[in-house]
């Protein structure tokens, strides 16, 4: 999917005001420096394609995160504020039901979600003259 | 616990340059915009431009872009701004500042200040 | 560039009175619904101090006695009731529009 034609500064409010809690809550009680950051984007659409990518697609030892609140609302926000996302995505919801797993949250997860807090960042103020 | 560790005073002639330096730790130093802001007592706080760690990409306010120059060292996680050609009109506290956790665009972390004082 | 203007430059209130804080921006820094203005505390020789950021919410370690309000262009920045500590130079903030700007500062005295 192509993010170019996104919504941003909406997709930045539903963020700020919702997405952002929940993913504090999914790493409460974890150091923010326990991490070493190695996904980086350098653009709003770059970004959002690195956000969808650890949020929905299933790495070896985090197979789980599709599920979490944050995803949810991700996919919402995504699907309200990029045109056709919605559509691009019922094939990828379909497969995802198949490989259902028991949640657990992993050292991997945990490390994920601490790449999506640089990546959500990152979207939110770009050094750009993006606002 | 952030903590930004700023470089110490500085006395400089006017037209020298100044090179300051600002080390972070407590936090991933690379996936934060880190700014520099300068204070003066009559002028208040000025915005100088910031830095993005994580690839060096900068903005800068138009007032200082000719003269400022910021750089990182993602190593040492350090930032640097150098400032060109002063004049006594840049005697001030410059501070380096970490943007918050979320991209709202404040500042919740600051370094102490480096004093700089620009005199013949 | 939006300009923010800060009234009064200055003001001194009796202890345990309320202290009011005007910013006004030369144009909205509202965004979808937000409102991206902050406001900073800075006392002599220390840095300044986050107190409040998007408007209203209250920045990590800040007493209730500090409040926000406003939108669009209008903000307030209310100190009920006012502290010994609390003298020093109060600063609102945008980030809707590059470049970041402050407002030149209210520096709020005892009476």
């Known amino acids: 999917y192509d993010f170019t034609n996104c919504d941003f500064e909406k997709i930045k409010a539903a963020y700020l005001s919702t997405i952002s809690k929940d993913l504090i809550t999914y790493m409460s009680g974890t150091k923010s420096t326990e991490f070493n950051n190695t996904v980086s984007c350098s653009n709003r659409p770059h970004c959002l394609t690195e956000i969808q990518s650890l949020t929905f697609n299933p790495t070896a030892g985090c197979a789980s995160l599709a599920k979490e609140m944050f995803a949810m609302k991700t996919k919402a926000a995504l699907a309200i504020w990029c045109p056709g996302y919605s559509e691009t995505q019922i094939n990828a919801t379909q497969a995802m039901k198949k490989r259902r797993k028991r949640k657990v949250t992993t050292n991997k997860c945990l490390e994920q979600v601490s790449q999506l807090q640089g990546l959500w960042r990152r979207f939110n103020r770009p050094l750009l003259k993006q606002q | 616990q952030a903590y930004l560790q700023q470089s110490g005073a500085e006395l400089v002639r006017p037209g020298a340059s100044v090179k300051m330096s600002c080390k972070a730790s407590?936090?991933?130093?690379?996936?934060?915009?880190m700014h520099w802001v300068k204070h003066t007592p009559g002028q208040g706080l000025e915005w100088i431009g910031a830095?993005?760690?994580?690839?060096?990409?900068?903005s800068y306010n138009q007032k200082f872009k000719d003269r400022a120059t910021l750089t990182v060292d993602k190593s040492s996680r350090t930032a640097y701004m150098q400032l060109s050609s002063l004049t006594s009109e840049d005697s001030a506290v410059y501070f380096c500042?970490?943007?918050?956790?979320?991209?709202?665009?404040?500042?919740?972390?600051w370094g102490a200040g480096t004093t700089v004082t620009v005199s013949s | 560039d939006i300009v923010l203007t800060q009234s009064p430059a200055s003001l001194a209130v009796s202890l345990g009175q309320r202290a009011t804080i005007s910013c006004r921006a030369s144009?909205?820094?509202?965004?979808?619904?937000?409102?991206?203005m902050h406001w900073y505390q800075q006392k002599p020789g220390q840095p300044p101090r986050l107190l409040l950021y998007?408007?209203?919410n209250l920045g990590s370690g800040i007493p209730a006695r500090f409040s926000g309000s406003g939108s669009g262009t209008d903000f307030t920045l209310t100190l009920n009731p006012v502290e010994t500590d609390d003298v020093a130079t109060y600063y609102c903030?945008?980030?809707?529009?590059?470049?970041?700007?402050f407002g030149a500062g209210t520096k709020l005295e005892l009476k």
């Open positions: 500042a970490r943007e918050d956790d979320y991209g709202e665009g404040y500042f919740d972390v």
């Open positions: 407590g936090f991933a130093f690379t996936t934060y915009n």
């Open positions: 830095i993005y760690p994580g690839n060096g990409e900068t």
């Open positions: 144009e909205s820094v509202d965004n979808s619904g937000l409102s991206f």
């Open positions: 998007r408007a209203s």
């Open positions: 903030q945008q980030i809707n529009t590059d470049p970041l700007t």
